[in-house]
């Protein structure tokens, strides 16, 4: 399964789309910056088996897909870009699911790292809470967009490390 290679390309495409989605100047949103507590440690460890690593990445993409599939998101972002972004994420999710099924036969370790997946879920809960508290303002969405771009970039490093391990 060459997921890290295909996923890396998909990740790059998703990042480009996210970058294009900006609607307002981020310079006006500095005071809205927020610490979402990206679970860096879940993307640092080398202890993962490949299927576990993919399941953590899958959760990250799934949560991002959910976040940008809300009606509040649709009201904020340019529709065609949003659709392209969602399609890209959906393709990545499908690729990952196929890859995990392939890996399960190879590995005898548990399919999922429950603690890591919970950490990713909580991270996105903090993002959703922030958006709610900020009443889904344009600046709040701009801060979240920047945060998701950062988390994608950090997970890209994780994927590259995963590829080197193969």
């Amino acid at each position: 399964c060459d997921l890290p290679q295909t996923h890396s390309l998909g990740n790059r495409r998703a990042l480009i789309l996210l970058a294009q989605m900006g609607r307002i100047s981020p310079f006006s949103c500095l005071k809205d910056r927020h610490d979402f507590g990206f679970p860096q440690e879940e993307f640092d460890g080398n202890q993962f088996q490949k299927a576990q690593a993919i399941s953590v990445l899958h959760e990250m993409i799934q949560q991002t897909f959910n976040l940008f599939s809300t009606k509040d998101s649709s009201a904020t972002w340019e529709q065609s870009l949003l659709e392209k972004f969602s399609t890209e994420l959906n393709q990545q999710l499908n690729d990952m699911e196929a890859c995990v099924i392939q890996e399960v036969g190879v590995e005898e370790t548990p399919l999922m790292n429950v603690d890591s997946i919970l950490a990713v879920k909580k991270y996105f809960q903090r993002i959703t809470l922030y958006l709610t508290e900020k009443k889904y303002s344009p600046c709040a969405w701009e801060v979240v967009r920047a945060e998701i771009m950062r988390s994608f970039s950090l997970s890209k490093i994780f994927q590259e490390r995963l590829r080197r391990k193969e």
Partner: antibody, heavy 121, light 107 residues
Framework: EVQLVQSGAEVKKPGESLKISCKGS????????IGWVRQMPGKGLEWMGI????????AYSPSFQGQVTISADKSISTAYLQWSSLKASDTAMYYC??????????????WGQGTLVTVSS | DIQMTQSPSSLSASVGDRVTITCRAS??????LNWYQQKPGKAPKLLIY???SLQSGVPSRFSGSGSGTDFTLTISSLQPEDFATYYC?????????FGQGTKVEIK
């Protein structure tokens, strides 16, 4: 290793134009903004302006608006500060520094070594 | 623009002394306040960001506190290499602005 490397010292005459540079390496250049700071001889730090290299969006301090132009070329990971007509009062050390934008990360954590600009007739 | 006022503008201290520098903003800047150290002929160096977070690699004798309009940089035990000029800077809104600086000299 993250580095911001600035172009060398410049000696110019009043009325001349100038463009100084700041090249980023060791990180994703478009993921950080680049700010410019002036320090006149024996004086404090003055914030001039900032650019988001991902889309070249800029913002200036009112004191420097119209006096300088900030630009970037993301293909070569370089930001620029330029003057169309220098004055003697532009004599100063100019620093570039990176800023994490809207991300929760240290502000201006890496700085260039500075470019000394001397304007004298 | 937000004005940043540092005090004192200079101070004399001895090695081992506890040194406190204050910075006041003309309006609330939440915790978006940074502290820099600058030595002659060198670029500024980030010490503290978001008012109280210690930048990686900076000795723990440096600490920052405050929020809103009043902020403090403390050096718990001054070392020979700490003699320099210190600047505060707000990053709450553009344009970013610096304090005028505090020069820490040897007594």
């Amino acid at each position: 290793e993250v580095q911001l490397v600035q172009s060398g010292a410049e000696v110019k005459k009043p009325g001349e134009s100038l463009k100084i540079s700041c090249k980023g390496s060791g990180y994703s250049f478009t993921s950080y903004w680049i700010g410019w700071v002036r320090q006149m001889p024996g004086k404090g730090l003055e914030w001039m302006g900032i650019i988001d290299p991902s889309d070249s969006d800029t913002a200036y301090s009112p004191s420097f608006q119209g006096q300088v132009t900030i630009s970037a070329d993301k293909s070569i990971s370089t930001a620029y500060l330029q003057w169309s007509s220098l004055k003697a009062s532009d004599t100063a050390m100019y620093y570039c520094a990176r800023h994490p934008g809207l991300n929760w990360a240290p502000d201006f954590d890496y700085w260039g070594q500075g470019t000394l600009v001397t304007v004298s007739s | 623009d937000i004005q940043m006022t540092q005090s004192p503008s200079s101070l004399s201290a001895s090695v081992g002394d506890r040194v406190t520098i204050t910075c006041r903003a003309s309006q609330s800047i939440s915790k978006f306040l940074n502290w820099y150290q600058q030595k002659p002929g060198k670029a500024p160096k980030l010490l503290i960001y978001f008012a109280s977070s210690l930048q990686s690699g900076v000795p723990s004798r440096f600490s920052g506190s405050g929020s809103g309009t009043d902020f403090t940089l403390t050096i718990s035990s001054l070392q020979p290499e700490d003699f320099a000029t210190y600047y505060c800077q707000q990053s709450n809104t553009l344009p970013f602005t610096f304090g005028q600086g505090t020069k820490v000299e040897i007594k």
